[in-house]
């Protein structure tokens, strides 16, 4: 290789020396010198650092506050932060998942296209012709109208996006 034009990937420049960064899970205690190596220490309980670094303090693990509807999805380590998610029936308001809101319900005339998760809200879609939803729900899809013909019945009342068809007996007087 030609002479380097910077310190190596896992190094930083301090006082004319290219010193090793501290590995994930450790913080910097003292920079290397002409006489000594970089000194690093492991992060404490409930602390982490997720990159090669020269930080003198580790970051605190995220707190999943139950008062905000949060719970721990994955416990943090010395190298990773805690991951929070929401209690059943709730979802995160942002990617960082700092608080939760109740899943939205799909109104009558709309069905659930995608059920909500801990990180995404319910996605609703209007019931197309031939389908209906007569309830407000976070789980129910649009249901197909009843097929009167298969029951040897006739449509007495047409369905809508909110109501099923009403079937009735065949008019026996009709030729």
């Amino acid at each position: 290789p030609e002479p380097p034009t910077a310190c190596r990937e896992k190094q930083y420049l301090i006082n004319s020396q290219c010193c090793s960064l501290c590995q994930p899970g450790q913080k910097l205690v003292s920079d290397c010198t002409e006489f000594t190596e970089t000194e690093c220490l492991p992060c404490g309980e409930s602390e982490f650092l997720d990159t090669w670094n020269r930080e003198t303090h580790c970051h605190q693990h995220k707190y999943c506050d139950p008062n905000l509807g949060l719970r721990v999805q994955q416990k943090g380590t010395s190298e990773t932060d805690t991951i929070c998610t929401c209690e059943e029936g709730w979802h995160c308001t942002s990617e960082a998942c700092e608080s939760c809101v109740l899943h939205r319900s799909c109104s009558p005339g709309f069905g659930v296209k995608q059920i909500a998760t801990g990180v995404s809200d319910t996605i609703c879609e209007p019931c197309p012709v031939g389908f209906f939803s007569n309830v407000s729900s976070a789980f129910e899809k649009c249901h197909p109208w009843t097929s009167c013909e298969t029951k040897d019945l006739v449509v007495q009342q047409a369905g809508t996006n909110k109501t099923d068809v009403v079937c009735g007996p065949q008019d026996r007087l009709r030729a």
Partner: antibody
Framework: QVQLVQSGAEVKKPGASVKVSCKAS????????MYWVRQAPGQGLEWMGW????????TYAQKFQGRVTMTRDTSISTAYMELSRLRSDDTAVYYC??????????????????WGQGTLVTVSS | DIQLTQSPSFLSASVGDRVTITCRAS??????LAWYQQKPGKAPKLLIY???TLQSGVPSRFSGSGSGTEFTLTISSLQPEDFATYYC?????????FGQGTKVEIK
């Protein structure tokens, strides 16, 4: 304190392969490039190449291209140098050495600040 | 490849002598030069890097100078523990090469 401890002496037949290990301690292994240098009996020093212990990417001197393989295991802070298709003129002491970089007058100056104790590889039929 | 030529190849000197070893490069290498000391059966030891910077722990009787193509290692007052072989190494152009060595012997 920084230490590079190499594996013991080896005797090999021509055409065989040898794998020399270099265990690092006293510093963050993935933070510094590791080099391999050899020295034939009574001769000077010959640079073979290096490995980036973080990524595992090696660079070999053209003379050894196709015969040398440099690897590492970061979990045990150890670098390896394997030389294949051995010939009698590969008889030498093989050293690992750590790279140090000094910054001065706008330039970055490398050198080898710590060396292993050396591993004698004898190739003889 | 850049060739490094050390002179002399052998040098007989007495304790207390001032000793100078020269290293000439076949092309300019700025200050990308290091000096190493090697004793029989031992690994090389870094003395000087960046042509003139003394490695920590190395006695101040050792000094380096030069840039471009001509470099010198000077031992101001030779001590018994300095009898060894000295190598220069260029780190300015691939492949990084070493001089053939200078053996300093007791007169």
């Amino acid at each position: 304190q920084v230490q590079l401890v190499q594996s013991g002496a080896e005797v090999k037949k021509p055409g065989a392969s040898v794998k020399v290990s270099c265990k690092a301690s006293g510093y963050t292994f993935a933070g510094y490039y590791m080099y391999w240098v050899r020295q034939a009996p009574g001769q000077g020093l010959e640079w073979m190449g290096w490995i980036n212990p973080d990524s595992g990417a090696p660079t070999y001197a053209q003379k050894f291209q196709g015969r040398v393989t440099m690897t590492r295991d970061t979990s045990i802070s150890t670098a390896y140098m394997e030389l294949s298709r051995l010939r009698s003129d590969d008889t030498a002491v093989y050293y690992c050495a750590r790279e140090k970089i000094y910054y001065g007058s706008g330039n970055y100056y490398p050198s080898f600040d710590y060396w292993g104790q050396g591993t004698l590889v004898t190739v003889s039929s | 490849d850049i060739q490094l030529t050390q002179s002399p190849s052998f040098l007989s000197a007495s304790v207390g002598d001032r000793v100078t070893i020269t290293c000439r490069a076949s092309q300019g290498i700025s200050s990308y030069l290091a000096w190493y000391q090697q004793k029989p059966g031992k690994a090389p030891k870094l003395l000087i890097y960046a042509a003139s910077t003394l490695q920590s722990g190395v006695p101040s009787r050792f000094s380096g100078s030069g840039s471009g193509t001509e470099f010198t290692l000077t031992i101001s007052s030779l001590q018994p523990e300095d009898f060894a072989t000295y190598y220069c190494q260029q780190l300015g152009s691939y492949p990084w090469t070493f001089g053939q060595g200078t053996k300093v012997e007791i007169k």
